[in-house]
């Protein structure tokens, strides 16, 4: 057993039908020694007197809020969560599986730039009775100081007969340096609380590896004269670091007709423009990379041909 | 060039080899959605690489105070990994048939490294550390981490010269 | 130049054996993933079986519990043990192997010039 935060405690079982459970030992936190109770939730019923009450932890029933009283006073309460573990590998009930890039990734985390700061995110399919802390550190044994906002709820879906919930996550490494190259992992910790079962989920990366530029921005056409072909020209995201001149991008344009059967023509520059054939009802998109590092492309900022 | 001295590299030909690198990097190891191999034992085999961090002037303010701390940790991390890549490491089984891009990464990063210092003039260079892998296995899984670090080592090591031919050409 | 041998194959009887075999020229450590696949004539080449390095094998539905792929390192080859064998499995069975980027910067995907299997009573 041990504490999640104050009076929240989490006991750590082993689920397999006749599992014996845990013996647990509560103390009601208050100076009087006599006369003491307990219950359990909002029920009645009096499982014990005295300062101290042993209980075995066993399933969900045997969880929850624990209170000792005295004379009708309540003087103090114990939240009891279950962590499940089964076949020696600990329950992941409360999240979905991303499947992205890999199996078993619960968390998905990106940055638009080396500023040190980056979101992550998850999904459930669980729409009460649900509670997120996030932590976050640069590497685990010496862990230098990640801060984490609160987790919201970011977006609803609806799949199949299933809703989705997609929570976030925003953290800002305290002291950045977007030039140096990283050799610890930025460390992400979830706790997820449903009800009475909690869950822990983790994942370690490089920002360099979640690198997501924005789109490109102020996409224009320029048409050649004489010609099909026309300039096309874009910026910088905004959000991307600075100067541009040592965090460099590539871009990918690509002419892409109406119908997704059609051939599309990809042109790869380091510049800001470059020069296409626009075909009657195509349209023209460019996406940006990270020069010198193949982390993700952005998604594609796009203008019609005509 | 980099000379200990502090004249400056041919930061355009600086450029276009650390170009050349990274595409050679990615080339030898692409980003796959995982490795194939179980990734064991992260910490010991690659903690030992030089890594360019953030004291040693290679963002954009201390390459304009002065240049050469950064240049001189970019040429030390080069020999470092020109080493590693002619190790038994990549020497072994399995073995690298004769159009390996490691072959080519090998020779540029020994370009790179004599560009910034030329004949005659010595920086310090680090110890590479005595790893040698009895198995197959090991040694792919050791050419992938150090095929991974190398491309972040490249990564900034490129912004550098990119920024440098840039602002600080003559 | 890589190279991949195919052999083994020949004729065998509705629920038989056979054994197929694919020497490498070069260590199997070099490929990431190496297979086994097969044709019949005027079909797609369909997937048998795939392993990769350090891994354990996966079979297509059709041949799950029927057949066995293994290797052996010090041999630099793979195998194909066909149990149960039905006239479905009928095809020329071809070897595969993905090679290691790092190894090579051409042809990182090696075939075999393929063994015929006749299922026939």
């Known amino acids: 057993i041990w504490e999640l935060k104050k009076d929240v405690y989490v006991v750590e079982l082993d689920w397999y039908p006749d599992a014996p459970g845990e013996m647990v030992v509560l103390t009601c936190d208050t100076p009087e020694e006599d006369g003491i109770t307990w219950t359990l939730d909002q029920s009645s019923e009096v499982l014990g007197s005295g300062k101290t009450l042993t209980i075995q932890v066993k399933e969900f029933g045997d969880a929850g809020q624990y209170t000792c009283h005295k004379g009708g006073e309540v003087l103090s309460h114990s939240l009891l969560l279950l962590h499940k573990k089964e076949d020696g590998i600990w329950s992941t009930d409360i999240l979905k599986d991303q499947k992205e890039p890999k199996n078993k990734t619960f968390l998905r985390c990106e940055a638009k730039n080396y500023s040190g700061r980056f979101t992550c995110w998850w999904l459930t399919t669980i729409s009460t009775d649900l509670t997120f802390s996030v932590k976050s550190s640069r590497g685990s044994s010496d862990p230098q100081g990640v801060t984490c906002g609160a987790a919201t709820l970011s977006a609803e879906r609806v799949r199949g007969d299933n809703k989705e919930y997609e929570y976030s996550v925003e953290c800002q490494e305290d002291s950045a340096c977007p030039a140096a190259e990283e050799s610890l992992p930025i460390e992400v910790m979830v706790d997820a609380v449903h009800k009475l079962k909690y869950e822990n989920y983790t994942s370690s990366f490089f920002i360099r590896d979640i690198i997501k530029p924005d789109p490109p921005k102020n996409l224009q056409l320029k048409p050649l004269k004489n010609s099909r072909q026309v300039e096309v020209s874009w910026e910088y995201p905004d959000t991307w670091s600075t100067p541009h001149s040592y965090f460099s991008l590539t871009f990918c344009v690509q002419v892409q007709g109406k119908s997704k059967r059609e051939k599309k023509d990809r042109v790869f520059t380091d510049k800001t423009s470059a020069t296409v054939i626009c075909r009657k009802n195509a349209s023209i998109s460019v996406r940006a990379q990270d020069r010198y590092y193949s982390s993700s492309w952005s998604e594609w900022a796009s203008v019609p041909c005509s | 060039r980099a000379v200990p001295g502090g004249s400056s590299p041919a930061w355009t030909q600086c450029q276009q080899l650390s170009q050349k690198l990274c595409t050679l990097a990615w080339s030898a190891h692409p980003l796959v959605g995982h490795m194939d191999l179980r990734e064991e034992g992260d910490e010991e085999t690659t903690n030992d690489v030089p890594h360019i961090q953030c004291g040693d002037g290679c963002d954009p303010q201390g390459l304009r105070d002065n240049s050469q701390f950064c240049l001189q940790r970019i040429h030390q991390g080069l020999i470092f990994y020109e080493k590693l890549l002619g190790s038994d490491i990549f020497t072994g089984e399995p073995s690298l048939l004769p159009d390996s891009p490691v072959g080519q990464l090998h020779a540029s990063l020994l370009g790179l490294s004599q560009l910034l210092q030329p004949e005659g003039h010595h920086w310090e260079t680090q110890q590479i550390p005595s790893l040698s892998p009895s198995q197959p296995w090991q040694r792919l899984l050791l050419r992938f981490k150090i095929l991974r670090s190398l491309q972040a080592f490249v990564a900034v090591a490129a912004r550098v010269f990119a920024h440098g031919a840039a602002t600080l050409s003559p | 130049e890589v190279q991949l041998v195919e052999s083994g194959g020949g004729l065998v009887q509705p629920g038989g054996s056979l054994r197929l075999s694919c020497a490498a020229s070069v260590s199997i450590w070099s490929f990431k993933v190496m297979g086994w696949y097969r044709q019949v004539p005027g079909k797609q080449r369909e997937l048998v079986a795939t392993?990769?390095?350090?891994?354990?094998?996966d079979y297509a539905d059709s041949v799950k519990g029927r057949f066995t792929m293994s290797r052996d390192y010090d041999k630099r080859t793979v195998f194909l043990e066909m149990d149960s064998v039905k006239p479905e499995d009928a095809a020329v069975y071809y070897c595969?192997?993905?090679?290691?980027?790092?190894?090579?910067?051409?042809?990182?995907?090696?075939w075999g010039q393929g063994t015929r299997v006749t299922v026939s009573s």
């Open positions: 595969n192997g993905r090679l290691w980027a790092h190894l090579t910067s051409s042809g990182h995907d090696v």
């Open positions: 392993i990769t390095t350090g891994g354990s094998p």
